[in-house]
């Protein structure tokens, strides 16, 4: 497996009750607007063929996509949570800016691309679904990167 570099987040990022609560509230609100319960974006399939030590790099890709292609286009919705959660996730993304893996990351890009394709295919409801899974994104980042 390729070696990961600088793929670490400080534990304290995930020990802030206020922003954790706001992230989960945002996910809950978006989830209640999601009528496509058959599709899961962040689940076993996302991590298939990706070793545990490569998963922070994978989650960095998912985080960046979520910020740029999901949260920004939907930034006027789900207030007041959105205006607090987006800067928090942007800080995490910035902290992972130097996270990369030495070697082939094709297997990771393939998995991330499947997630992106699913969101794009579902259109706005895909974006809502991604916001509804911010709790899973949060927990997966914590598991993968601390």
């Amino acid at each position: 497996a390729p070696v990961s570099s600088h793929c670490r987040l400080d534990k304290s990022n995930f020990q802030q009750p206020y922003i954790t609560n706001r992230t989960f509230m945002l996910a809950k609100e978006a989830s209640s607007a999601d009528n496509n319960t058959d599709v899961r974006l962040i689940g076993e399939k996302l991590f298939r063929g990706v070793s545990m030590s490569e998963r922070c790099y994978l989650m960095k890709q998912v985080l960046n996509f979520t910020l740029e292609e999901v949260l920004l286009p939907q930034s006027d919705r789900f207030q007041p949570y959105m205006q607090e959660v987006v800067p928090f996730l942007a800080r995490l993304s910035n902290s992972l800016s130097t996270c990369h893996i030495e070697g082939d990351d094709l297997h990771i890009q393939k998995n991330v691309q499947k997630l992106k394709d699913t969101v794009k295919k579902l259109g706005e409801s895909g974006e809502i679904k991604a916001i509804g899974e911010l709790d899973l994104l949060f927990m997966s980042l914590r598991n993968a990167c601390i």
Partner: antibody
């Protein structure tokens, strides 16, 4: 409460097929992966393969050519099939559930195992 | 495949004592090591994963440490129910592989 229970014939003839069943309760097979692990008498554990929550499978290359894992979600059962058995395949066969979707390679819940003897 | 070398094979201790079991991976597995307890007639029990995370229900007298290739399971203030077989397992990549086991016996 999460439970797994293996069952199957205790004695199998050499060259025949081993086919234990894992019956689960307390969780859905469409939400969690189930792994098969074997243990030779008094020896270490050996990971055989996995049934993913979406029905896909992964196998240990040491077994790939003679191993097959299938499931029946309506009966909450996962099946292991291994052909061309030799006496070295004697041992205890376990099924185990992964911890969650993220820690999918961590075996959090195990069945008590089913003992298989390969002998004529 | 990653080879897990577990030492010692056998260990004898008295209740109240502390013991350590070691596990060495043939290549780096970051922090992704799990420890299991095996007792006759009982289902195998996950004690620790990710090197040091206690599984729900695991008593606090159990602790795990280490990263990269070298890991240790420590049991402090041994209780009678702690005696049995212990296995390490790397859960970083496939195929999942286990150590050869350590038999912890009452002295």
């Amino acid at each position: 409460e999460v439970q797994l229970q293996e069952s199957g014939p205790g004695l199998v003839q050499p060259s025949q097929t081993l086919s234990p069943t894992c019956t689960v309760s307390g969780f859905s097979l469409t939400s969690y992966s189930v792994h098969w692990v074997r243990q030779h008498s008094g020896k270490s554990l050996e990971w055989m393969g996995r049934m993913w929550s979406d029905g896909d499978t992964s196998y240990n290359s040491a077994f790939t050519s003679r191993l097959s894992i299938t499931r029946d979600t309506s009966k909450s059962q996962v099946f292991l099939k291994m052909n061309s058995l030799q006496t070295e395949d004697t041992g205890t066969y376990y099924c185990a559930r992964s911890l969650d979707f993220y820690y999918d390679t961590t075996l959090a819940f195990w069945g008590p195992g089913t003992t298989v003897t390969v002998s004529s | 495949d990653i080879v897990m070398t577990q030492t010692p094979s056998n260990l004898a201790a008295s209740p109240g004592e502390s013991v350590s079991i070691n596990c060495k991976a043939s290549k780096t597995i970051s922090k992704y090591l799990a420890w299991y307890q095996q007792k006759p007639g009982k289902a195998n029990k996950l004690l620790i994963y990710s090197g040091s995370t206690l599984q729900s229900g695991t008593p606090s007298r159990f602790s795990g440490s280490g990263s990269s290739t070298d890991f240790t399971l420590t049991i402090r203030n041994l209780e009678p129910e702690d005696f049995g077989l212990y296995y390490c397992q790397q859960h970083n990549e496939y195929p999942l592989t286990f150590g050869s086991g350590t038999k912890l016996e009452i002295k």
